[in-house]
């Protein structure tokens, strides 16, 4: 079944833009002028998930790229990375649930919990041009929180 | 506050053209989803389509072909451009505010636009 | 493509009644349900979404339930202001959204 999908970029609370940081890693960092044409495109997509009562799932792929943010158990700990797909197959309403995030959206913030890993966060360091990762904790020191932009093409 | 305003409303023979405009204030469009929804007098609302960024715009299946959304988020503006107009196209238009990306529910809508198709 | 069916279409009933107006969906839709309210010349207002949850400024007479393909819409105390069109939404069907008819509520 066809999917609603999106062309967007996401910068954290604090400004920072989401950037590519080798094939298989997004960092993020403060961009300016025309460095901010080195932000990811990110195709959101609505896909099926649990029922709850306002968290809406998504999964992040890379515009144009057959990449997808997926979570997964490495060495015992909830990892994010960018994983291969074949393009012919996504996106789709039925995502396998390392590709799902329950995008939580309060006072045009976001959030974007793994569902995968329930209350683990897409998250950014306060430190620039570190990796963007999956975080287990909300309201600490790692920025969880996201503003996102439509992207005209 | 936040206010949705449609304009571009009016009698319009069959066959012909118009485009319905929705202007926002209190909140910017660069990441907010619309849709325009319409009614027929006396009956129920039928939605027509939504646009997210400029290049993802989805509609019902009767819209497609004829009916056209865009945006130009400099003048935090919607569009709703429609051809081939039928006696049956006959309505109120509103735009609306998704009320969260992909939520699917509208949670600000616009007074309406009437269009009336006829000769 | 999903088709929204509310029933009944036509209900009449006095202040202070409860009043409960369902909607069926051709297949299930999880809880991806909306309710309207909209009055004669008006826009609709956002009365419930994800089948339960009340929408801001909705007063607690409002409720909503149901999951999958049975959903419903209670007024548990029917107030003057009340007597409008209401209708039902699927929100998360694919790339389109379909409304049920509508239910009028009148006065008996």
């Known amino acids: 079944a066809p999917v609603r999908s999106l062309n967007c970029t996401l910068r954290d609370s604090q400004q920072k833009s989401l950037v590519m940081s080798g094939p298989y890693e997004l960092k993020a960092l403060h961009l300016q002028g025309q460095d901010m044409e080195q932000q990811v495109v990110f195709s959101m997509s609505f896909v099926q998930g649990e029922e709850s009562n306002d968290k809406i799932p998504v999964a992040l792929g890379l515009k144009e790229k057959n990449l997808y943010l997926s979570c997964v158990l490495k060495d015992d700990k909830p990892t994010l990375q960018l994983e291969s797909v074949d393009p012919k197959n996504y996106p789709k309403k039925k995502m396998e649930k390392r590709f799902v995030f329950n995008k939580i959206e309060i006072n045009n913030k976001l959030e974007f919990e793994s569902a995968q890993f329930p209350n683990w966060y897409i998250s950014t360091s306060q430190a620039e041009n570190m990796p963007v990762f999956l975080g287990g904790t909300k309201g600490g020191q790692d920025i969880t929180d996201f503003t996102m932009q439509f992207v005209s093409s | 506050e936040v206010q949705l305003v449609e304009s571009g409303g009016g009698l319009v023979q069959p066959g012909g053209s118009l485009r319905l405009s929705c202007t926002a204030s209190?909140?910017?469009?660069?990441?907010?989803?619309m849709a325009w929804v319409r009614q027929a007098p006396g009956k129920g609302l039928e939605w027509v389509g939504i646009?997210?960024?400029?290049?993802?715009?989805y509609y019902a299946s009767w819209a497609k072909g004829r009916f056209t959304i865009s945006r130009d988020t400099s003048k935090n503006t919607v569009y709703l451009q429609m051809n081939s107009l039928r006696a049956e196209d006959t309505a109120v238009y509103y735009c609306?505010?998704?009320?969260?990306?992909?939520?699917?529910?509208?949670?600000?809508w616009g007074q309406g636009t009437l269009v009336t198709v006829s000769s | 493509e999903i088709v929204m069916t509310q029933s009944p279409s036509t209900l009449s009933a006095s202040v202070g009644d409860r009043v409960i107006i369902t909607c069926q969906a051709s297949?299930?839709?999880?809880?991806?349900l909306s309710w309207y309210q909209q009055k004669p010349g008006k826009a609709p207002k956002l009365l419930i979404y994800r089948a339960s949850t009340l929408a801001s400024g909705v007063p607690s007479r409002f409720s909503g339930s149901g999951s999958g393909a049975e959903f419903t819409l209670t007024i548990s105390s029917l107030q003057p202001d009340d007597f409008a069109t209401y209708y039902c939404q699927n929100t998360g069907g694919g790339v389109s959204i379909a409304f049920g008819q509508g239910t009028k509520l009148t006065v008996l």
């Open positions: 609306a505010r998704e009320r969260q990306i992909f939520s699917g529910d509208m949670a600000g």
């Open positions: 297949q299930s839709i999880d809880n991806w």
């Open positions: 209190g909140f910017s469009l660069s990441s907010a989803a």
């Open positions: 646009i997210y960024d400029s290049a993802s715009t």
